[in-house]
């Protein structure tokens, strides 16, 4: 029968007694930076080219016995998971291996850097089709390694890395913390985070998605026909590298941003038991398990968006947090979140010619997060319209006044420490969906975009009684671009998007009276692109 991991990444419409994906990744080359490999294994013989690159440290210990099958174990297994004939994800992909880990699985930052430079030079000398680089390794945070990954990613290479097996925040490790890299955590057959002894998969905002990473059958370096189960985020990353190879083979022109958005879009949502993660990491960790798209073609018409969390601002009074989108993405909205509820909102601002999302901590606050909604919107022209505090009883308002511009997100930011306390809520006048409203003491920011065929609508969900969480979702065919809370709800901790749902979080209801102050309204802005849909139909 089909191994559980291959079944798990197969969309339901393809489910069968065997794994038979529509495209095997034959146009893509996958580089593997790992241990040496047993290239004559029946799973990978003829599929993996062992390069002459080797940069590894000496093995520790005087009694270390270098046994070939042990030296090759990790790399052989991963090569098999990516492209193995029997148990591989992308059965058509070809691979090249670089040895950067020694027989004990240890490497150096310098060895990995030189390996990445080797790939960059190979790409310049002999450009081929799309490239995927698999980095199934994790070490302490390294600014220089992250920068090298950024350079290679900006040269058009897709980098996929393991989140790490330290049951810790992936942002503390490299290359997992590099924003340009697709960082993968590990789940098991029950879609739960993988436990490895006393440790387990890493988590947090630097993880892009999870993938099967426990009890994964693959090529064993024991013998040329041997198979073995291995576990870890390396195996999970190998699955995503294989899926990426198949997506790129079907659509070779996909950019890194487009690929990442598709990986997120086609993932299984909300299947991971978040209780495994530390409480403060649950909201930051994506509840996504990688899967192949139901069809390798025809996804171009969708408006893809993802949520990007900033690092924590820290608790100082004037602390801020910044969330950024990838170079090819548009920032369509900006929100903020604070566990203490003490925050001074958020704003979109230009930084280096690109919009970023900045959240502001408040006096006595434990810190804030900025949350960016990053979307793929070709030919978009977006700008931010700001209304300063109105000081008028009706509150502050701002709308998109340019012809053809639509509202994609609302943000509000205030200077006073406790905005909204004892203030009545401001109600949005009906029939004016293209505007943002806020407190009279707040400055309001509207994200206004013009793009061919772009249309947006506002959806609200209000609950009169206090509740810890209020949600509103966009319906099928629409994509959530903006998520905010209607002003007047002083106990709101913040708002953020989870997939296509806008979540507004409030303080523990036991601390809130059930006056009108208790009313919580979540406001979602849902968009779609008729232009992308029409273009897709023409192509087909």
């Amino acid at each position: 029968s089909i191994p559980w991991n291959l079944e798990r990444i197969t969309p339901p419409r393809y489910r069968a007694d065997e794994y038979q994906p529509p495209d095997g990744g034959s146009l893509v080359e996958v580089y593997l930076l790992d241990t040496s490999i047993q290239s004559d294994h029946r799973e990978i013989e003829g599929r993996v080219m062992v390069t002459d690159f080797e940069n590894v440290p000496e093995e520790d210990g005087t009694r270390f016995h270098r046994q070939a099958s042990k030296c090759d174990s990790h790399g052989t297994h991963l090569a098999g998971v990516v492209s193995g004939r029997d148990a591989g994800v992308a059965k058509g992909a070809s691979m090249r291996s670089l040895r950067v880990l020694n027989c004990q699985g240890k490497g150096t930052v310098s060895g990995t850097l030189i390996g990445l430079e080797f790939i960059r030079k190979s790409q310049l000398v002999q450009p081929v089709g799309p490239l995927v680089v698999l980095l199934p390794l994790a070490g302490g945070y390294s600014r220089v390694l992250n920068a090298a990954c950024q350079r290679l990613a900006r040269a058009g290479v897709v980098l996929v890395t393991a989140a790490g097996n330290f049951r810790d925040d992936a942002c503390l490790y490299s290359p997992a913390s590099a924003p340009e890299v697709i960082t993968v955590g590990a789940t098991n057959a029950q879609d739960q985070p993988v436990t490895l002894g006393t440790l387990g998969t890493n988590f947090g905002r630097c993880v892009d998605l999870f993938a099967p990473g426990e009890d994964i059958i693959g090529a064993s370096s024991d013998c040329s026909t041997c198979f073995v189960s291995q576990s870890g985020t390396s195996q999970a990353a190998a699955h995503v590298a294989g899926i990426a190879a198949m997506m790129l083979s079907a659509e070779p022109e996909l950019t890194l941003a487009e690929l990442r958005q598709r990986l997120i879009h086609f993932s299984a949502k909300d299947v991971i038991n978040e209780a495994w993660f530390p409480e403060d990491q649950r909201v930051l960790t994506p509840n996504l398990v990688a899967a192949l798209p139901p069809s390798t073609h025809g996804a171009g018409w969708q408006l893809f968006c993802r949520t990007v969390w900033s690092a924590h601002s820290g608790p100082t009074r004037m602390a801020t947090a910044v969330a950024r989108c990838a170079p090819d993405e548009e920032l369509l909205s900006c929100s903020s979140f604070s566990r203490s509820g003490k925050r001074r909102g958020e704003r979109m601002e230009a930084q280096g010619g690109k919009l970023v999302c900045r959240a502001h901590n408040a006096f006595g606050g434990e810190g804030v997060y900025a949350i960016a909604r990053c979307c793929l919107l070709p030919q978009a022209n977006c700008s931010v319209h700001t209304a300063p505090p109105a000081e008028a009883s009706m509150g502050t308002r701002v709308h998109c006044h340019q012809q053809g511009h639509v509202l994609t997100g609302c943000s509000s930011h205030w200077e006073v420490e406790d905005l909204g306390t004892h203030k009545p809520p401001v109600l949005r006048p009906r029939g004016q969906p293209n505007q943002c409203v806020g407190h009279r003491e707040a400055s309001i920011h509207a994200s206004c975009c013009h793009a061919p065929g772009l249309e947006c609508k506002v959806k609200e969900h209000g609950i009169p009684a206090p509740q810890e969480q209020v949600t509103v979702a966009c319906e099928e065919g629409w994509t959530l671009t903006g998520c905010s809370a209607l002003p007047g709800t002083s106990h709101v901790l913040g708002a953020y998007a989870v997939d296509n749902t806008c979540v507004v979080r409030s303080r523990d209801v036991s601390t809130t009276g059930s006056t009108s102050e208790g009313a919580v309204t979540a406001v979602a802005i849902c968009c779609r692109s008729r232009h992308l849909a029409q273009a897709s139909q023409e192509l087909q």
Partner: antibody, heavy 119, light 113 residues
Framework: QVQLVQSGAEVKKPGESLKISCKGS????????ISWVRQMPGKGLEWMGL????????RYNRKFQGQVTISADKSISTAYLQWSSLKASDTAMYYC????????????WGQGTLVTVSS | DIVMTQSPDSLAVSLGERATINCRSS????????????LAWYQQKPGQPPKLLIY???TRESGVPDRFSGSGSGTDFTLTISSLQAEDVAVYYC?????????FGQGTKVEIK
């Protein structure tokens, strides 16, 4: 259901060429290896080699390397075993079998093709 | 190449009695990484293709009666038919699949006494 159907018995003269076939059905032919096994009259089983139809990767038993060619046409889910110049010692029953990582040569075997080479 | 040697070459057992076939490999087919023996047993009846009975030295293929069992590790293996039935008359082969070329034992013919 999953099955492998082999071509019929062949009677050939020494020096002639021959290509026998093995057609898979009921499963994704490209995703499983096909092995060929020889059984000479009254003798035991000998593994000759295998092919992975997905990419036409082959692996031969050294004993048979250069004596036979294993190939496949994935468009018609068929694997082949061929000889360019038969010898009397090639007289045998030839079996194809589906091969997968969790099994050696699985329970899916062809019915066998009897090849007789005689002048 | 790994050489597989079976004993005995033939075996006559009364109906309902135990039949034991041994197989020895010229090198170990046990691998530490998954602690599995890459050894299988096949049954072949006259005019039929072989049928897989046991793999990983002791795992019974689905549909195979539980009177068939496999044991052993490393280089020495045994196939046991706990209570011989008339339909068990056949030639039995052991096979290693730990390295290429895959090799079979010479076969053991089981008959009814």
């Amino acid at each position: 259901q999953v099955q492998l159907v082999q071509s019929g018995a062949e009677v050939k003269k020494p020096g002639e060429s021959l290509k026998i076939s093995c057609k898979g059905s009921g499963y994704s032919f490209t995703n499983y290896y096909i092995s060929w096994v020889r059984q000479m009259p009254g003798k035991g089983l000998e593994w000759m080699g295998l092919i992975y139809p997905g990419d036409s990767y082959t692996r031969y038993n050294r004993k048979f390397q250069g004596q036979v060619t294993i190939s496949a046409d994935k468009s018609i889910s068929t694997a082949y075993l061929q000889w360019s110049s038969l010898k009397a010692s090639d007289t045998a029953m030839y079996y194809c079998a589906r091969d997968y990582y969790s099994r050696p040569l699985s329970d899916v075997w062809g019915q066998g093709t009897l090849v007789t080479v005689s002048s | 190449d790994i050489v597989m040697t079976q004993s005995p070459d033939s075996l006559a057992v009364s109906l309902g009695e135990r039949a034991t076939i041994n197989c020895r490999s010229s090198q170990s087919v046990l691998y530490s990484s998954n602690n599995k023996n890459y050894l299988a047993w096949y049954q072949q009846k006259p005019g039929q293709p072989p049928k897989l009975l046991i793999y990983w030295a002791s795992t019974r293929e689905s549909g195979v009666p539980d009177r068939f069992s496999g044991s052993g590790s490393g280089t020495d293996f045994t196939l046991t038919i706990s209570s011989l039935q008339a339909e068990d008359v056949a030639v039995y082969y052991c096979q290693q699949y730990s390295s290429f070329p895959i090799t079979f034992g010479q076969g053991t013919k089981v008959e009814i006494k």
